[in-house]
């Protein structure tokens, strides 16, 4: 295929791939029909003068992963072609003034992942086409106002995982076509007014894990198209009220590790489009009536590892749309009976590691197509009559670790566990805590006549269709319906995932599918 | 329907303690939030706290905290609010008041006239 | 806590007139308003909630609107059995608290 070099492999799509320890340099003869080129995981330290300069056709250029830490000013010259460049994974600390000169139909530019200390507003002047710019994962600490001026066709900005402590308000200024700004894993503590108002398209903002305390309350006012917002895993202790306020399209928000003691009332809107809301781990104390309520098509609502001990019963109101409720690991002693009330859609309810004493008998009547319900680790000792009863779809409901009192009113509870075990999993089954001489006993199987020999039974009306047998043994070990796999945060959508984190540490997290938090 | 009742007038001498009781009926008593509010006369209204009937967990505003003491008892649907330290001031018209599908306060008690008079 | 700051303290007006009684609070409280009607001798009635839901069985001459600081209820047409004392109140954040009231009475 023109001349391969040895050290490559040619395929016919004039494909060029090189790789392998034994490069120290730009293999050549290149065929000059090349269209893409990789050059991986070499120990090429330095780019020359004009390595590709018998290659003008070539549209993509892959030099990742190799020990490169030097690269001359006209080492792309010749690349009139050129709209894909990564240099992604090399061991660049400067980049020498130029180098992109002549690049006139790049699209792509990928530093991400080098030791780049600084970047000037010269280094990407000539690069007008670009429409992506990659600079995650290096150690640039701060951006010089013009630095972007002239890439006004930008549509993805990656700035994360450097060391930033402070954006100017102006650096993004002429980039109204970008959709795709990510700032995470920076040490920004504050963000100035301003600093978005040009991003007029801009779809989707990361800045979590940085180190922000305050929002500006009309940080996002200009921002009408975003869709995702991710503030995650900063210092955030109070929200303005209206700083979600111009936010129509936003359909993922993430406020997980911050230090939220309250929510503002009205803060979430309106936002008809929002589907996921994460406020895990935060310090949120109670969630007081409508504090939702513009959040109509909410599909997903975490708010577990706060310190919730009051909910309103109005709490909830406007969520009609809600799958999924995580309240796990809260304070919770007790909930009004009307407080899921308005939740007619809800699939997945984790309450555990909570203070329940006890349940309202209609805690789920209206909460028809519920299909998983998680009580483990309360202070239970029994439920209400009947309810579950209604709850057709039930697959998936965690009693263990309660205290559960096994006297004479906890038969209609254990008839009907007795006829619906397979719903409570293989792993771990309720056990009676009291009295003292049933301690530790299955309650599925418990005969009640032994634990309160001195009571005469009466005759409990029993949960609908389920007789009481006595000494039932248990049924066979059935596997649980639905597992309790547990994402950290969000899949966050990225394309360069930086920083999905995927764990199955059931001990910690407990929850059903999508109840991440 | 959903009923309060509360027990009849009390006259109290400065610096004793008076109870007031409110019967419920009309639905589940433990599964739902129990307030008591005050009306001095010709004056408006002041909320003092809450009672989960369930768990007997209470609160109670800051003005009244060390003062009030809200209890239940299961058996009967009744909620207690018992205020020492009796003044002048304390002399009101109190109400039992149950919140609905949101943290406002949708059933009354008939209300307790408590007057605080040496 | 929360100041609830309701004007006028009274009003009089005649049956068929239009009533408008306002209600501030110190701070935001999003739309967690109740409006209350209160007869001599006799507890409060709930109006609305929800700064403009009605209560069931209220009539529909009584209405109210507002979120965050600033809150109105309008009495559309006032009637006879009107005439009596309206409570504004807050319930976003403990403790719960009350407007002064307003008293409506014939003129």
């Known amino acids: 295929y023109h001349g391969c070099p040895s050290e490559c492999t040619c395929s016919r799509a004039s494909q060029v791939e090189c790789t392998g320890a034994r490069i120290v340099a730009v293999p050549t003869p290149l065929p000059w029909n090349a269209m893409s080129l990789q050059i991986l995981n070499t120990h090429i330290t330095e780019l020359n003068e004009s390595p590709f300069l018998n290659i003008s056709a070539l549209i993509a250029l892959r030099i990742e992963k190799n020990e490169l830490s030097r690269i001359t000013p006209g080492a792309f010259r010749n690349l009139g072609s050129l709209r894909y460049l990564s240099l992604a994974n090399n061991k660049l600390q400067v980049l020498p003034i130029g180098l992109f000169q002549g690049l006139d139909s790049l699209e792509s530019l990928l530093l991400s992942s080098n030791q780049l200390l600084q970047i000037q507003p010269a280094h990407f002047s000539q690069c007008s086409n670009l429409k992506e710019l990659q600079l995650h994962g290096n150690h640039l600490e701060y951006i010089p106002d013009g630095a972007f001026d002239h890439l006004v066709g930008l549509t993805k900005l990656n700035l994360g995982k450097n060391s930033l402590t402070h954006i100017s308000p102006r650096v993004f200024q002429h980039l109204g076509n970008l959709q795709v700004l990510r700032l995470y894993e920076n040490r920004l503590t504050d963000i100035p007014m301003g600093t978005f108002d040009g991003l007029v398209n801009l779809q989707e903002l990361a800045l979590q894990q940085n180190q922000i305390g305050l929002l500006s309350p009309g940080l996002f006012h200009n921002n009408h198209n975003l869709q995702r917002l991710y503030l995650s895993n900063n210092h955030i202790s109070q929200l303005p009220p209206s700083v979600f306020m111009q936010l129509p399209q936003l359909n993922r928000l993430t406020l997980f590790g911050n230090s939220l003691k309250e929510l503002s009332p009205g803060i979430f809107g309106p936002m008809p489009n929002l589907r996921e809301l994460w406020l895990y781990d935060n310090h949120i104390s109670s969630l007081p009536d409508n504090v939702f309520s513009n959040l109509r098509q909410l599909q997903v609502l975490i708010l577990s590892r706060n310190q919730i001990s009051f909910i309103s019963p109005g709490a909830f109101n406007g969520l009609t749309e809600l799958r999924e409720l995580s309240l796990h690991t809260n304070a919770l002693q007790d909930l009004d009976g009307n407080v899921f009330r308005m939740l007619a859609n809800l699939q997945n309810i984790s309450l555990q590691n909570n203070r329940l004493r006890q349940l309202p008998g209609n805690i789920f009547a209206n909460v028809n197509g519920l299909m998983a319900i998680q009580l483990q680790n309360n202070q239970l000792e029994n439920l209400p009559l009947g309810i579950f009863d209604h709850l057709g779809k039930l697959c998936e409901l965690r009693l263990y670790d309660n205290p559960w009192r096994c006297d004479s009113d906890i038969l209609p509870l254990r008839n009907w566990l007795l006829l619906n075990q397979p719903r409570l999993g293989t792993d771990t089954v309720p056990v009676c805590f009291s009295p003292a001489n049933v301690r530790g006993q299955s309650l599925i199987i418990i005969n009640v006549n032994v634990a309160v020999p001195s009571v005469h039974v009466p005759e409990v009306p029993s949960y609908p269709e389920t007789p009481w047998y006595p000494d039932t043994p248990s049924y066979p070990d059935t596997t649980s319906v639905s597992s309790t796999t547990e994402l950290t945060s969000p899949v966050e959508d990225y394309t360069d995932l930086t920083t999905i984190q995927v764990t199955d540490d059931r001990s910690v997290w407990g929850m059903t599918q999508a109840q991440s938090g | 329907q959903v009923q309060l009742v509360q027990s009849g007038a009390e006259v109290k001498k400065p610096g004793a303690s008076v109870k007031v009781s409110c019967k419920a009926s009309?639905?589940?008593?433990?599964?739902?939030?129990i307030n008591w509010v005050r009306q001095a006369p010709g004056q408006g209204l002041e909320w003092m706290g809450w009672?989960?009937?369930?768990?007997?967990?209470?609160k109670y505003a800051q003005k009244f905290q060390g003062r009030v003491t809200m209890t239940r008892d299961t058996s009967t649907s009744t909620v207690y609010m018992e205020l020492s330290s009796l003044r002048s001031e304390d002399t009101a018209v109190y109400y039992c008041?149950?919140?609905?599908?949101?943290?406002?306060?949708?059933?009354w008690g008939q209300g307790t006239l408590v007057t605080v008079s040496s | 806590d929360i100041q609830m700051t309701q004007s006028p303290s009274s009003l009089s007006a005649s049956v068929g007139d239009r009533v408008t009684i306002t209600c501030k609070a110190s701070?935001?409280?999003?739309?967690?308003v109740a409006w209350y009607q209160q007869k001599p001798g006799k507890a409060p009635k709930l109006l609305i909630y929800?700064?403009?839901y009605r209560s069931s069985g209220v009539p529909s001459r009584f209405s109210g609107s507002g979120s965050g600081t600033d809150f109105t209820l309008t009495i559309s047409s006032l009637q006879p059995e009107d005439f009596a004392t309206y409570y504004c109140?807050?319930?976003?954040?403990?403790?719960?608290?009350f407007g002064g009231g307003t008293k409506v009475e014939i003129k």
């Open positions: 109140q807050q319930y976003n954040a403990f403790p719960y608290t």
């Open positions: 701070q935001n409280v999003g739309i967690n």
């Open positions: 929800s700064a403009s």
């Open positions: 009672i989960y009937p369930g768990s007997g967990n209470t």
């Open positions: 008041a149950r919140w609905g599908y949101g943290a406002y306060f949708t059933y």
């Open positions: 009309g639905y589940t008593f433990t599964d739902y939030y």
